[in-house]
């Protein structure tokens, strides 16, 4: 089996963490949260080759089924496999408040 | 806000849960599970539009940061939010084997 | 909920080096845009910023100071640890940590007094 | 480093009355400013974020505003319980710093 690591594509080109610069408007955050301004949005982009990181057996079998059935089966896609936490300093009708979440920024990636 | 599980596609032109017939032989599986010898897979398929089935914040930000830079930063995409375990038959050195599989085949979909 | 404690010797000799521990609860020294900040405060005077450190391990210091300051933290154990060289009398205060998000003090310890005397 | 110089050091005044603080940054921090109160024997409790955003819990007879250089918390009818110290801090830039603080009594 190949290395579930090695990208048969080239260098950077197969399902892995990238970071994106974002402003709150960018996020169509600007309306409810005061902080922070800028955000280092981390999430997964790339290709999935067969047997590249494969999250389960179901991703397997998804890989398998797209090489026979290309038009009816899509092949695996590059999703988080865990998150990091972020926390926002939110507007309220009040004022602020903080609030803390776990399912923001991608902390690495697999093929599902 | 639109409607989470309104498709604005069209008719099951968004992500949600699609059955395949397929074989061992087209599992990539005949060299070693004897049972069964053709399984109706369960498997995420279709598009993710805005709002749709948002698994999480995460997906609420990849597809603002997509509008934005839609050559960077892919849509999200469909993939199992659950799984529905499954028993298999497997060829043994000595013969035989019972084993449940826990993320074999998809129950539920959101996109992420 | 979020809380901070403070420990530390209470009283050190002049020359010596305060060694503080802040255990954090509640919160995650490794979530992003969170931080923890270590503030002093002399017996009827003003606050006095004296470092911190962020969930990514970038390390701000109060720049009077900088010399003799260090600053670190340890995830796992929920705690961040700030050492002060080459005390004075003049390093006699009440020591706080508190909960830095993007640079504003949330939550604060109760703070620990530390006395300088020979 | 930018000085946050707080006005008056000390004052007094009436159970009802609107009292307000000052605080001056020696250069622009935008609306990078915090406000804390300190009670007697107390650590400080945050108050104000982003010069006029009150944080969750805080009385709404407390108000913050300001931007640039200049800045102001107001307490729109004193209680007897705000009897405190009042810090101001910027964090537009590092170092972080505080006003000496404002010792808030009652007549």
């Known amino acids: 089996a190949r290395n579930g690591d090695r990208c048969p594509l080239g260098p950077g080109r197969c399902c892995r963490l990238h970071t994106v610069h974002a402003s709150l408007e960018d996020l169509g955050w600007a309306d409810w949260v005061l902080s922070p301004r800028e955000v280092q949005v981390t999430m997964c982009i790339g290709a999935c080759p067969s047997q590249f990181r494969e999250a389960n057996m179901h991703a397997q079998i998804k890989m398998n089924l797209h090489r026979l059935k290309p038009d009816t089966v899509p092949a695996p896609c590059c999703v988080p496999a865990s998150y990091n936490p972020m926390v926002l300093i939110q507007k309220t009708d009040t004022g602020v408040s903080l609030q803390t979440y776990d399912d923001l920024l991608a902390k690495d990636c697999h093929c599902v | 806000a639109r409607n989470g599980d309104r498709c604005p596609l069209g008719p099951g032109r968004c992500c949600r849960l699609h059955t395949v017939h397929a074989s061992l032989e087209d599992l990539g599986w005949a060299d070693w599970v004897l049972s069964p010898r053709e399984v109706q897979v369960t498997m995420c398929i279709g598009a993710c539009p805005s709002q749709f089935r948002e698994a999480n914040m995460h997906a609420q930000i990849k597809m603002n940061l997509h509008r934005l830079k839609p050559d960077t930063v892919p849509a999200p995409c469909c993939v199992p939010a659950s799984y529905n375990p499954m028993v298999l038959i497997q060829k043994t050195d000595t013969g035989v084997s019972l084993q449940t599989y826990d993320d074999l085949l998809a129950k539920d979909c959101h996109c992420v | 909920q979020v809380q901070l404690q403070e420990s530390g010797p209470g009283l050190l000799k002049p020359s010596q080096t305060l060694s503080l521990t802040c255990t954090v609860s509640?919160?995650?020294?490794?979530?992003?845009?969170?931080?923890v900040g270590w503030i002093r405060q002399p017996a009827g005077k003003g606050l006095e910023w004296l470092a911190n450190?962020?969930?990514?391990?970038?390390?701000y210091y109060n720049s009077a100071l900088k010399s003799r300051l260090t600053i670190s933290k340890d995830t796992s154990k929920n705690q961040v640890s700030l050492k002060l060289s080459s005390v004075t009398a003049a390093d006699t205060a009440v020591y706080y940590c508190a909960q830095e998000v993007y640079g504003w003090f949330a939550y604060w310890g109760q703070g620990t007094l530390v006395t300088v005397s020979s | 480093d930018i000085q946050m110089t707080q006005s008056p050091s000390t004052l007094s005044a009436s159970v009802g009355d609107r009292v307000t603080i000052t605080c001056k940054a020696s250069q622009n921090v935008g609306t990078n400013v915090a406000w804390y109160q300190q009670k007697p024997g107390q650590p400080p409790k945050a108050l104000i974020y982003?010069?006029?955003y009150r944080y969750s819990g805080v009385p709404d007879r407390f108000s913050g505003s300001g931007s640039g250089t200049d800045f102001t918390l107001t307490i729109s009818s004193l209680q007897a319980e705000d009897v405190a110290v009042y810090y101001c801090q910027q964090y537009n830039s590092y170092p972080l710093t505080f006003g000496q603080g404002t010792k808030l009594e009652i007549k």
């Open positions: 509640g919160f995650s020294l490794s979530t992003y845009g969170m931080g």
């Open positions: 450190i962020w969930w990514n391990d970038d390390k």
């Open positions: 982003s010069a006029s």
